[in-house]
């Protein structure tokens, strides 16, 4: 058993049918010695008397808010949550496996640049009685500071018969140098509590591996005289790290017909312009990627050919 | 990435082309190592990230773009003295800092070159003959060092008398390649920045 926060405790259970559970001793936070009784949640049934209460915690029915009273007055509370260990592996019932980039990916994180700011998000089908708390650091043995905000519900989607809820959080490394070479990963830890179930999820990454630039901005077409060709030009996204000559991007320019089956023409360039043939009803799209470290491509920025 | 590669203009900063080749070569070598050594811990998540140049050179600090010198988090400076004459500086008026930056890059390359050569000698003794260092990568390191053209004491190649532990050597190779790739990215950024300056 360990304390999650004041008066909230997590009991770790080896979870299998007929498991013996864990013996827990609760102590009433009071100078009083006599006449103390204990109850669980809203029930008025007296579970025991005395300054301490010993209970065998086996199932969720044994978890909840234990309260000690004296003469009708509440003295203190202890909320017991359960953390299930199923065959040596902590349960992951609360969050959905996003399966990208690999199986057992519960937390996904992205950064728009090298400033040390990043966003993480996760999915669940649970809509109520759910709380999250996020902590982060650079490294784990001698952790350096990363400050995270509160997790917020950022999107709701309907997936088949189920509703899916997306939560996200923004974090910022306290003293980040965009040019630094990372040798210790960022660690993100999410505590999730659903009713009386506690779970924790972690992710470990280097900012350089989660970079995904914003799409190029100011995408423009300039027709070339007496030609089917156009000059496409664009700019670095505002959110990208500066100076751009140091934090350079490379670009992919794509000409896509109306039909998805039509052949796509693609050109790769380090410049912020390219000359392409504009077909009728086609669209031109440009996306960006760090020129020197191949992390994710940005989303496409698009303009119609006409 | 297997993308079309632009050839540098003749008037371009001489080292940019070499640094681009270096990054390509080390990335290819790392990819080859990860495929060949699939049963070894060789991915970024599995290895310890060690920097053999730590406390010996200060490339990131010495090569910091001017725009980032206002960022206090970037000024974790280490005092290192370097020789300051190099051919990449030839066609430009350069500050002492730029000379320091390029000589720091040269020292990095020299250190990695020695490590890689020592390691290759060990790998050649492996009866499994599982992996060797790409000669192209070693050649590209050499070319960039020549382009930087710093006069520097030669570091003797380390020779080891004890029987090599090939498992440890291969893990060390992965660690070295990951670190060298990160340094090659920094070198490429620096060369690109200097070219634009």
């Amino acid at each position: 058993i360990w304390e999650l926060k004041k008066d909230v405790y997590v009991v770790e259970l080896d979870w299998y049918p007929d498991a013996p559970g864990e013996m827990v001793v609760l102590t009433c936070d009071t100078p009083e010695e006599d006449g103390i009784t204990w109850t669980l949640d809203q029930s008025s049934e007296v579970l025991g008397s005395g300054k301490t209460l010993t209970i065998q915690v086996k199932e969720f029915g044994d978890a909840g808010q234990y309260t000690c009273h004296k003469g009708g007055e509440v003295l203190s509370h202890s909320l017991l949550l359960l953390h299930k260990k199923e065959d040596g592996i902590w349960s992951t019932d609360i969050l959905k496996d996003q399966k990208e980039p690999k199986n057992k990916t519960f937390l996904r994180c992205e950064a728009k640049n090298y400033s040390g700011r990043f966003t993480c998000w996760w999915l669940t089908t649970i809509s109520t009685d759910l709380t999250f708390s996020v902590k982060s650091s650079r490294g784990s043995s001698d952790p350096q500071g990363v400050t995270c905000g509160a997790a917020t519900l950022s999107a709701e989607r309907v997936r088949g018969d189920n509703k899916e809820y997306e939560y996200s959080v923004e974090c910022q490394e306290d003293s980040a140098c965009p040019a630094a070479e990372e040798s210790l990963p960022i660690e993100v830890m999410v505590d999730a509590v659903h009713k009386l179930k506690y779970e924790n999820y972690t992710s470990s990454f280097f900012i350089r591996d989660i970079i995904k630039p914003d799409p190029p901005k100011n995408l423009q077409l300039k027709p070339l005289k007496n030609s089917r060709q156009v000059e496409v030009s664009w700019e670095y996204p505002d959110t990208w790290s500066t100076p751009h000559s140091y934090f350079s991007l490379t670009f992919c320019v794509q000409v896509q017909g109306k039909s998805k089956r039509e052949k796509k023409d693609r050109v790769f360039t380090d410049k912020t312009s390219a000359t392409v043939i504009c077909r009728k009803n086609a669209s031109i799209s440009v996306r960006a990627q760090d020129r020197y470290y191949s992390s994710s491509w940005s989303e496409w920025a698009s303009v119609p050919c006409s | 990435r297997n993308l079309p590669v632009a050839t540098p203009d003749p008037g371009m900063f001489p080292c940019l082309h070499h640094s681009q080749n270096l990054l390509r070569a080390v990335s290819n070598m790392l990819q080859k190592a990860r495929q060949t050594l699939e049963f070894y811990p060789c991915t970024s998540e599995e290895i310890d990230h060690e920097d053999i140049t730590k406390d010996k050179t200060s490339t990131v600090e010495a090569c910091l773009p001017l725009e980032l010198t206002k960022n206090e988090s970037c000024l974790n400076s280490r005092e290192t003295s370097f020789i300051t004459n190099g051919s990449c500086l030839a066609s430009r008026k350069t500050s002492f800092m730029m000379a320091l930056c390029l000589s720091s890059i040269y020292e990095d390359l020299k250190m990695y070159q020695v490590e890689f050569k020592t390691m290759n000698a060990k790998l050649l003794m492996d009866p499994k003959r599982q992996i060797f260092l790409d000669q192209n990568m070693l050649a590209v390191i050499d070319e960039l060092m020549q382009a930087l053209n710093f006069n520097s004491e030669t570091v003797p190649q380390k020779s080891s008398l004890e029987e090599p532990d090939f498992y440890k050597t291969k893990i060390k190779l992965c660690i070295l390649l990951h670190a060298f790739r990160i340094r090659a990215v920094t070198i490429d950024r620096v060369m690109s920045y200097l070219n634009a300056s």
């Epitope: 080896d14 979870w15 299998y16 049918p17 007929d18 498991a19 199932e59 969720f60 260990k85 199923e86 065959d87 040596g88 592996i89 019932d93 690999k102 199986n103 057992k104 089908t125 | 049963f39 811990p41 599995e46």
Partner: antibody, heavy 115, light 112 residues
């Protein structure tokens, strides 16, 4: 004590269907994940499928994906395995089993796929 | 489809020490715990070892398990005639959990 009693096995022709049941008692069935495991005659153990305690997630071996469906009825304390498009290579003893560090197995039920 | 490799058979005389190996990889045994099962002919498997080296109550202490890196082993010290059975190791793969990963199985024969 914990008990898992299996039923539903038998002889079936290739291409036909069969449904296995596993009735649980002696524990809170709705709190635990459940597996199906099979063993072809003279061969080793092969995992078939898993279902979460609440039925929200199901996982299958590649060899049965798209043909077998694992389900549970927590109000009846029963686990099921619906087997469709049966093949000769599905011939095996099928076991249900609880998920956890200490597990309980059903007695097994024989499924023979033969024309 | 078996990722955990066991020797097909091992044998010993009563009282001898018999060991069965179970060889896997970094993503399974290297990252997860190992169980061992005993299966007597015509019966369901019986749990002998969980959590690499833990014995459930009722399992004789002549059975012991261990794990090192990407391999595990089961030792029977002082093997007895009633130990003649098939033995299976089991673990998980970090990419496919909760799918059970079984070993190929080992037939233990007690001679004489």
């Amino acid at each position: 004590q914990v008990q898992l009693v299996q039923s539903g096995g038998g002889v079936v022709q290739p291409g036909r269907s069969l449904r296995l049941s596993c009735a649980a008692s002696g524990f809170t069935f709705s709190s635990y994940g459940m597996h199906w495991v099979r063993q072809a005659p003279g061969k080793g153990l092969e995992w078939v499928a898993f279902i979460r305690y609440d039925g929200s997630n199901k996982y299958y071996a590649d060899s049965v994906k798209g043909r077998f469906t694992i389900s549970r009825d927590n109000s009846k304390n029963t686990l099921y395995l619906q087997m469709k498009s049966l093949r000769a290579e599905d011939t095996a003893v099928y076991y249900c089993k609880t998920h956890g560090s200490h597990d309980n197995w059903g007695q097994g039920t024989m499924v023979t796929v033969s024309s | 489809s078996y990722v955990l490799t066991q020797p097909p058979s091992v044998s010993g005389t009563p009282g001898q020490r018999v060991t069965i190996s179970c060889s896997g990889g970094r993503s399974n045994i290297g990252n997860n715990t190992v169980k061992w099962y005993q299966q007597l002919p015509g019966t369901a498997p019986k749990l002998l070892i969980y959590g690499n080296d833990q014995r459930p109550s009722g399992v004789p202490d002549r059975f012991s398990g261990s794990k090192s890196g990407t391999s595990a082993s089961l030792a029977i010290t002082g093997v007895q005639a009633e130990d003649e059975a098939d033995y299976y190791c089991q673990s998980y793969d970090r990419g496919t959990h909760p799918a059970l990963l079984f070993g190929t199985g080992t037939k233990v024969t007690v001679l004489g």
